[in-house]
C-alpha cells in the first residue's frame, strides 16, 4: 500500500475581506483511519481552525461531506474572511487513537487577505499661514492588505513631489496603515485651491480613493489698505474712505481713529466674494473740517483674523478759519455751515504683517 500523503495543492490563496476562503487538502490514502485537523501556524502555539471529529467551528465548513464514503477530500471553506485570518494553514492527518496521534501534515497554504484601505483623511495645519509660507498636510488611510500601496498628492490637479510617506508596520501584519505628509507653498491665489491625497491599492480595481482638504482652511491673505479722499463738500465735510482689499478669511475689524482717538469700530460681515475667494471692504468717514483748528490725523486700523493690527494713517490739512460758537470741535457724520480748506496728506503706511 502506498504511504499516505497529505496534499495541499495551493501554496497561497488570496481572498478579499468579507468573502469566503477555500483551503484545499486531499489525502492519497484511506489508511490509516483518523481525522483531519486544520491549524494556523506551526508548533505548540498553533491555532486549531477545524477538527473533523470534535468541536464547534461556526465559520468553517468542510467542502466535501465528511460522512461521504471513502472521503479523501478534507478541504474547508472559511466564511467572512477578515484581515485577522491571514496566515499559513496546515491540513494535518491524525491516526485514530486515544488520543488521536498526529501522522502527517500538508505543506501549508498561506492565506492572504485583500482588505481595502479606508477613505483617506487629509488634515491641514492647526493655524493659518500666509502666502509664500510652506504648510504641511497629512493624509492617513488604514486597514489595507497586502502592504503594497501607492499614494500621490495633487494641488489643483498638479502632482506634488515634496512629500514623505510611511507604511506601518514595517514587518508582517494582518493589515497596514499609510501616513503621508506633503509640504505645500501657499500663494495669495490659493483660497480656492485644494490638495488631494490619492491612494491606489490592488483591492480598488484601478479606482483610487481620494481625500481632499481646502487650502481655505490653511491660508490667511492679509489685506492691502488704501485711502481716498473726496474733495471738500459745500458743508465743509470731507468724505474719507479706507479700502481694505484682497483679504481672507472674512474675520476683520476696522477702527477709525481721529488724532489717536477712536472714532468708530466696525466688523466685516456678509461681504461679497472676489473671484479668487478673497474679500474687499470699504469703510468711509465724514470729517467735519471746520470743527478742527489743526490738521486732523486719521488712522484706519485693521485687525484681520486675530493678527496684530495693520494701520494706515494720513492727515487732513485744515486752513485757518474763524470758529463759530456752538460748533463741534470734531465731527463725524455731522454737517456745519463752516467753510474751510484742507489738504490731503497720506502719511507713511504702517503695515505690521505678522506671520507664523
Amino acid at each position: 500500500e502506498e504511504e499516505l500523503q497529505v496534499i495541499q495543492p495551493e501554496k497561497s490563496v488570496s481572498v478579499a475581506a468579507g468573502e469566503s476562503a477555500t483551503l484545499n487538502c486531499t489525502a492519497t490514502s484511506l489508511i490509516p483511519v483518523g481525522p483531519i485537523q486544520w491549524f494556523r501556524g506551526v508548533g505548540p502555539g498553533r491555532e486549531l481552525i477545524y477538527h473533523q471529529k470534535e468541536g464547534h467551528f461556526p465559520r468553517v465548513t468542510p467542502v466535501s461531506d465528511p460522512t461521504k464514503r471513502n472521503n479523501m477530500d478534507f478541504s474547508i471553506r472559511i466564511s467572512n474572511i477578515t484581515p485577522a485570518d491571514a496566515g499559513t494553514y496546515y491540513c494535518v492527518k491524525f491516526r485514530k487513537g486515544s488520543p488521536d496521534v498526529e501522522l502527517k501534515s500538508g505543506a501549508g497554504t498561506e492565506l492572504s487577505v485583500r482588505a481595502k484601505p479606508s477613505a483617506p483623511v487629509v488634515s491641514g495645519p492647526a493655524v493659518r499661514a500666509t502666502a509664500e509660507h510652506t504648510v504641511s498636510f497629512t493624509c492617513e488611510s488604514h486597514g489595507f492588505s497586502p502592504r503594497d500601496i501607492t499614494l500621490k498628492w495633487f494641488k489643483n490637479g498638479n502632482e506634488l513631489s515634496d512629500f514623505q510617506t510611511n507604511v506601518d508596520p514595517a514587518g508582517k501584519s494582518v493589515s497596514y496603515s499609510i501616513r503621508s505628509t506633503a509640504r505645500v507653498v501657499l500663494t495669495r491665489r490659493d483660497v480656492h485651491s485644494q490638495v488631494i491625497c490619492e491612494v491606489a491599492h490592488v483591492t480598488l480595481q484601478g479606482d483610487p480613493l481620494r481625500g481632499t482638504a481646502n487650502l481655505s482652511e490653511a491660508i490667511r491673505v492679509p489685506p492691502f489698505l488704501e485711502f481716498t479722499q473726496q474733495s471738500m463738500r459745500a458743508d465743509n465735510q470731507v468724505n474719507v474712505t479706507c479700502q481694505v482689499m484682497k483679504f481672507y478669511p472674512q474675520r476683520l475689524q476696522l477702527t477709525w481713529l481721529e488724532n489717536g482717538n477712536v472714532s468708530r469700530t466696525e466688523m466685516a460681515s456678509a461681504l461679497p466674494e472676489n473671484k479668487d475667494g478673497t474679500y474687499n471692504w470699504t469703510s468711509w468717514l465724514l470729517v467735519n473740517v471746520s470743527a478742527h483748528r489743526d490738521d486732523v490725523k486719521l488712522t484706519c486700523q485693521v485687525e484681520h483674523d486675530g493678527q496684530p493690527a495693520v494701520n494706515k494713517s494720513f492727515s487732513v490739512k485744515v486752513s485757518a478759519h474763524p470758529k463759530e460758537q456752538g460748533s463741534n470741535t470734531a465731527a463725524e457724520n455731522t454737517g456745519t455751515n463752516e467753510r474751510g480748506s484742507s489738504d490731503y496728506k497720506d502719511d507713511d503706511d504702517k503695515h505690521h504683517h505678522h506671520h507664523h
Epitope: 484511506l30 483511519v33 471529529k53 461531506d65 460522512t67 464514503r69 471513502n70
Partner: antibody
Framework: QVQLVQSGAEVKKPGASVKVSCKAS????????INWVRQAPGQGLEWIAM????????HYNQIFKDRATLTTDTSTSTAYMELRSLRSDDTAVYYC????????????WGRGTLVTVSS | DIVLTQSPDSLAVSLGERATINCRAS??????????IFWYQQKPGQPPKLLIY???NLDSGVPDRFSGSGSGTDFTLTISSLQAEDVAVYYC????????FGQGTKLEIK
Amino acid sequence: QVQLVQSGAEVKKPGASVKVSCKASGYTFTNYWINWVRQAPGQGLEWIAMIDPSDSETHYNQIFKDRATLTTDTSTSTAYMELRSLRSDDTAVYYCAMDYGSLYAMDYWGRGTLVTVSS
Amino acid sequence: DIVLTQSPDSLAVSLGERATINCRASKSVSSSGYNYIFWYQQKPGQPPKLLIYLASNLDSGVPDRFSGSGSGTDFTLTISSLQAEDVAVYYCQESWELPTFGQGTKLEIK
C-alpha cells in the same frame, strides 16, 4: 473520548413498537454515520441500517426496510431506532455503532439494549 | 447482496500457537487498492470491537499479534501467538455494498 450510551432494556408484546436511543458524546455528532446492529441470543451480528446525522440520509437492510425507522436529534446528539410490528424473533440486543472512517464500518459501539418480545 | 462465509465455525488452538480464521465473499470486495473487509472480536457480554479495517490495517490499540491479509474474495485473520484473552467470537464484515457480517467463528483454547 467517543461514547455511545444506549437506553435501558425493554420488554414488549408482539405487534408493539420499540424505540431505542443512543446518545453520542466525545465527537461531532453530525460528522459520522451511526449504524444499528442486532444480535439475537446465541446468534451472530445482523446489520439493520445506518443514518448520517448531518442530513438524515439513511440506508436500510432490505429485511428491515418496512419495519425500522432511524432518526436523529442533532440538538442532543442522539440517534434513535424504532422497530415496529415486533415478533418474538426480534428478541435481541440492539447496538448502535459509529463509523469513524466513513468506510461503512463500526469503530465504536454502544453497550447494547436488550429488547425482549414476549406475550 | 454479498454473502460472507467464515471458516471454520469454531476453532480450538493451544496457547502460544497460531490461529487462522478465513472469510470468503460471494463476490470481490476489492477496488482501487482497497479491500473492504473488517474484522471484529466479541467477548461474552460485550459489544464487538473493531480489530482490523480494510483487510490488513490494525485498529488503534490492537495488539500486533493480530494481522489481516487477503484480497478479492478471500481474506484471513491471523493471531500469531494465541493468548488467553483472545478467546472470543470473531466476525468479518464487508462494506463493498451495504454492510453484511459473516456468521462468526468461535475461538477457544485447546
